[in-house]
């Protein structure tokens, strides 16, 4: 276990007995929870890799950046950060890698300044639909969240509830229309097979959307039309076979967009012709010369940009692994 930081450092660690003696009272201005490091100057508290099983009750009121990574929190109950006086300054909260499997309704209530939340690398088998909105009203008070990081929150298959993981996550994103101000959403590495069609339309402020390293096969029913502020769309490392005309037109219509499409198993047959034509003309795709055919075998490793219509014929035979993707 690490020892308290020296007094020369801007971080301080209180002795455990001090923390326990006052944990039921409002925190003292310079108090630091046991097993944490605090810097009032940086408005930062770090309780990292300490196997904490609950959120410390005696967090200092000045905290603006709170790191609770690498712990064993398991459950985040309603009002997990509700304090008296409230943590009115808390703007960035990182809970990644803390073995959370349940986040309950209202877990982040009473955090009026919370702009960045990172729940990555937690096996979230049970994410309440009202985790971010705090209430089950059809229209909730707007959340202050601007950045929501949910990379690799998919639980192991044997721990999943008997429902769609995609559906569970989307329900939490859309509940009460609380996240209308969200600008960055990261959903990488979650084994998503599809993107529910209504999700993007209800997040109109998005600037950055990361869906990389999922298992998305198609974007046919996904609409990007309303995302007029979208600046980056990460779709690398999925199972995309082709992008169809509707999707291509919508992406081209977004004024600030950069799209990342590397490492998808593009199928270079007759259905690819529109995408190839678009790639040759568009400036929105980053690193477009790196996009290569994966199937059929005779087209493998061919660069999409260099194909012409004569190359793109339709042969119904696909390898078994692709038919089942």
């Amino acid at each position: 276990s690490s020892s308290p930081t020296s007094s020369a450092s801007s971080f301080s660690s209180s002795a455990p007995f001090l923390a326990s003696a006052v944990s039921a009272q409002p925190p003292l201005p310079d108090q630091c929870p046991a097993l944490c490091e605090c810097s009032e100057a940086a408005r930062t508290v770090k309780c990292v890799n300490r196997n904490l099983t609950e959120v410390p009750t005696d967090l200092p009121a000045y905290v603006r950046n709170l790191f609770l990574t690498g712990n064993q929190l398991a459950v985040l109950p309603a009002g997990a950060f509700a304090r008296r006086p409230p943590l009115a300054e808390l703007a960035a909260l990182n809970l990644s890698g803390s073995r959370l499997d349940e986040v309950r309704a209202g877990a982040f209530e009473h955090l009026p300044s919370l702009r960045q939340l990172d729940l990555s690398h937690n096996p979230l088998a049970d994410l309440s639909p009202f985790a971010f909105s705090g209430s089950n009203a059809s229209v909730s008070a707007p959340s202050p969240l601007v950045e929501l990081i949910l990379n690799h929150i998919v639980p192991p298959e044997d721990e999943r509830q008997n429902r769609s993981f995609e559906g569970m996550v989307v329900a939490a994103l859309l509940a009460g229309r609380a996240l209308q101000g969200l600008r960055r959403l990261e959903l990488a590495s979650n084994h998503f097979l599809y993107l529910p069609r209504d999700v993007l339309a209800q997040l109109p402020s998005l600037r950055h959307l990361d869906l990389s390293n999922n298992s998305l096969v198609s974007l046919t029913y996904v609409s990007f039309r309303n995302l007029t502020h979208l600046e980056s769309l990460h779709l690398e490392d999925n199972a995309l076979k082709v992008l169809h005309n509707g999707t291509l037109a919508e992406l081209q219509g977004l004024p600030h967009i950069r799209v990342f499409l590397d490492n998808n198993p593009w199928v270079c047959d007759c259905h690819m012709a529109d995408m190839v034509t678009w790639l040759k003309e568009t400036e929105v795709v980053q690193g477009k010369d790196r996009l290569t055919c994966a199937y059929p075998e005779k087209m493998r490793n061919r660069v999409l940009l260099e194909l012409n219509s004569a190359d793109l014929d339709c042969d119904p035979i696909l390898p078994p692994s692709l038919q089942t993707s």
């Epitope: 490392d237 490492n263 010369d289 290569t292 490793n301 260099e306 692994s321």
Partner: antibody, heavy 116, light 107 residues
Framework: QVQLQQSGAELMKPGASLKLSCKAT????????IEWVKQRPGHGLEWIGE????????NYNERFKGKAIFTADTSSNTAYMQLSSLTTEDSAIYYC?????????WGQGTTITVSS | SIVMTQTPKFLPVSAGDRVTMTCKAS??????VAWYQQKPGQSPKVLIY???NRYTGVPDRFTGSGSGTDFTFTISSVQVEDLAVYFC?????????FGAGTKLELK
């Protein structure tokens, strides 16, 4: 059928530079990336980098930046790799291959020996 | 860089044996793995792509499987002409990296 024909073996002095060639036939040269791979006994296969001949786009393994430079001549369907400031560590077989995902066709290799 | 740890280094075999070698990636690479055969004095030849797909013309005694970090390459009944070094390669992220190889040799 696809073929990659590489230049012959070379014996070089330390500090010298040389240019290896890889002539492609049997496919559209500009339409696929050419990869370069180094093989030394006891060191296995090591990716040096790649070039897309039609666009002269290149990507290098960090370890070989400053050591290797790729070029391509689309009129002769030939890719080149220049190696500079040779040392004994550069003694190896160098392969060109067609790829980007797996490397589906390989040249026969060029053996380079660096010795004073 | 992603490290591909290939085991075993040497595999003593007799004709007709079923043999298996494995490759473990230092992080998930999806199914972006190929297997190559290299005979003495020759360049490598790709046998398997996307972890489990055999290239046309590759005998069906060669099979690959796995995803994520653990991959397996099997020869169901070794022939004398299969004596060679076999390499795995990941192409999930740059730089592409290879395993150190498994050498098949006669018992």
């Amino acid at each position: 059928q696809v073929q990659l024909q590489q230049s012959g073996a070379e014996l070089m002095k330390p500090g010298a530079s040389l240019k290896l060639s890889c002539k492609a036939t049997g496919y559209t040269f500009t339409g696929s990336w050419i990869e370069w791979v180094k093989q030394r006994p006891g060191h296995g296969l090591e990716w040096i980098g790649e070039i897309l001949p039609g666009r002269s786009s290149t990507n290098y393994n960090e370890r070989f930046k400053g050591k290797a430079i790729f070029t391509a001549d689309t009129s002769s369907n030939t890719a080149y790799m220049q190696l500079s400031s040779l040392t004994t560590e550069d003694s190896a077989i160098y392969y060109c291959a067609r790829g980007r995902r797996d490397f589906d066709y390989w040249g026969q290799g060029t053996t380079i020996t660096v010795s004073s | 860089s992603i490290v591909m740890t290939q085991t075993p280094k040497f595999l003593p075999v007799s004709a007709g044996d079923r043999v298996t070698m494995t490759c473990k990636a230092s992080q998930s690479v999806g199914n972006n793995v190929a297997w190559y055969q290299q005979k003495p004095g020759q360049s490598p030849k790709v046998l398997i792509y996307d972890a489990s797909n055999r290239y046309t013309g590759v005998p069906d005694r060669f099979t690959g499987s796995g995803s994520g970090t653990d991959f397996t390459f099997t020869i169901s009944s070794v022939q004398v002409e299969d004596l060679a070094v076999y390499f795995c390669q990941q192409y999930y992220s740059s730089p592409p990296t290879f395993g150190a190889g498994t050498k098949l040799e006669l018992k």
